[in-house]
Interface confidence: medium
């Protein structure tokens, strides 16, 4: 038993690591594997993560982290039993990949104009909630070149736009992802998407 | 939110036994090694006893002070953690706090008063 | 056993002036990129309060007039500018190793 591709981790810098590898054959990684993690510290406590399968020869690994600050860095040793077959190390600053925002909500009841608002997906004890911006996805449910992202590079999570920029009388749908540039982050995985019909009043045309 | 709440403490006579125990709510008690450390009237932080988790083999570690005579446990499925103090002294008379431990001793119960007198 | 000496014993501050509070270790606590110092505050019948860890980050919801400095054997706990609600005993605290110990404390008081 072998590692074809080594671990690679990311981490949401709240409680949660995620590690990934491929191994070089089909394995049931839950019975065969553990993947150990401790805390480069002196009297940190190791922990064992069991992993699950990520397709045929593929595993996946949740390391329960349930506190990260910048300067840790974490000790990876994997193993088949008593069988060692890889050993590394991860810096969970120096591989954020933030997570998704929620409750991506659309309020259309604002004159003719579109608000849509979510919520911050950390704690605002945590490093990353005062630095994420966003960028909101919208595109139409008809036509598929109607797509269009608007980038919020303040902090505040929302976004207003104009009705009349979106043809009326459609269905569109919204999501929203999550970066955070001080940890040169990945962006985060799309928030479940919302739907709204789209209607507004067009103005009269002047003669 | 990070919860410890300490009981158990009260006034024995000397030579006597007693058993703290520390509920604990709001993180994952399984990851973290758990201390007590004590405070006797007027005076300053003293460390007691620590245990580690279970993939340390659970571990524990004891001041010179209390050795042979204090045991710490934990039950990782209850979020419980002990200290079962026998042949107290006057000495002991202390608060006895319980207290996570990862990077530093981050979060601390409110205390439980052990008096140790005749 | 690792000893921490902390100085002064007592200090007396004017609002809004810096109060500095030393803790000295008789060998060192850094090692390996780290120095397991910590700082806690603890004010008349409540449990110390996580300051400052690993000699110079603040912890999650302490204000920024906290600072800590070290390395090796000298630490330094700085608060700038004090406020009234700082009145409380200071306490220097290693974890290098077993046992951990714990300085004798600074009582901070308001002139």
């Known amino acids: 038993m072998k590692v074809l591709q080594e671990p690679t981790c990311v981490s949401d810098y709240m409680s949660i690591s995620t590690c990934e590898w491929k191994m070089n054959g089909p394995t049931n990684c839950s019975t065969e594997l553990r993947l150990l993690y401790q805390l480069v510290f002196l009297l940190s406590e190791a922990h064992t993560c069991i992993p699950e399968n990520n397709g045929g020869a593929g595993c996946v690994c949740h390391l329960l982290m349930d506190d990260v600050v910048s300067a840790d860095n974490y000790t990876l040793d994997l193993w088949a039993g008593q069988q060692l077959l890889w050993k590394g190390s991860f810096k969970p600053s120096e591989h954020v990949k933030p997570r998704a925002p929620g409750n991506l909500t659309v309020h259309t009841n604002v004159s003719d104009t579109l608000l849509l608002t979510w919520s911050n997906p950390y704690p605002p004890d945590n490093y990353l909630y005062n630095h994420l911006t966003y960028a909101v996805n919208i595109w139409s449910e008809n036509d598929p070149a109607d797509f269009r992202i608007y980038n919020v590079t303040y902090l505040e999570p929302s976004l207003r736009i104009a009705a009349s920029t979106l043809k009326s009388g459609i269905s569109y749908r919204a999501r929203v992802r999550a970066w955070a540039q001080c940890y040169n982050t990945t962006w985060s995985e799309w928030s479940p998407s919302t739907k709204w019909h789209n209607s507004y009043r067009e103005p009269f045309e002047q003669h | 939110e990070v919860q410890l709440v300490e009981s158990g403490g009260g006034l024995v006579q000397p030579k006597g036994s007693l058993k703290l125990s520390c509920a604990a709510s709001?993180?994952?008690?399984?990851?973290?090694?758990m201390n007590w450390v004590r405070q006797a009237p007027g005076k300053g932080l003293e460390w007691v006893a620590r245990?580690?988790?279970?993939?340390?083999?659970?571990?524990?570690y004891y001041a010179d002070s209390v050795k042979d005579r204090f045991t710490i446990s934990r039950d990782d499925s209850a979020s419980m953690f002990y200290l079962q103090m026998n042949n107290l002294k006057t000495e002991d008379t202390a608060m006895y706090f319980c207290?996570?431990?990862?990077?530093?001793?981050?979060?601390w119960g409110q205390g439980t008063s052990v008096t140790v007198s005749s | 056993d690792i000893v921490l000496t902390q100085s002064p014993a007592s200090l007396v501050v004017s609002l809004g002036q810096r109060a500095t509070i030393s803790c000295r270790a008789s060998q060192s606590v850094s090692t390996s990129g780290y120095s397991y110092m910590h700082w806690y505050q603890q004010k008349p019948g409540q449990p110390p309060k996580l300051l400052i860890y690993?000699?110079?980050n603040v912890q999650s919801g302490v204000p920024a007039r906290f600072s800590g400095s070290g390395s090796g054997t000298d630490f330094t706990l700085n608060i700038h500018p004090v406020e009234e609600e700082d009145v409380a005993t200071y306490y220097c605290h290693h974890n290098r190793d077993l046992p951990f110990t714990f300085g004798s404390g600074t009582k901070l008081e308001i002139k």
């Open positions: 245990i580690r988790t279970k993939s340390n083999h659970y571990s524990t």
């Open positions: 709001g993180f994952s008690f399984n990851m973290y090694a």
């Open positions: 690993l000699a110079s």
């Open positions: 207290v996570r431990h990862l990077r530093a001793m981050d979060y």
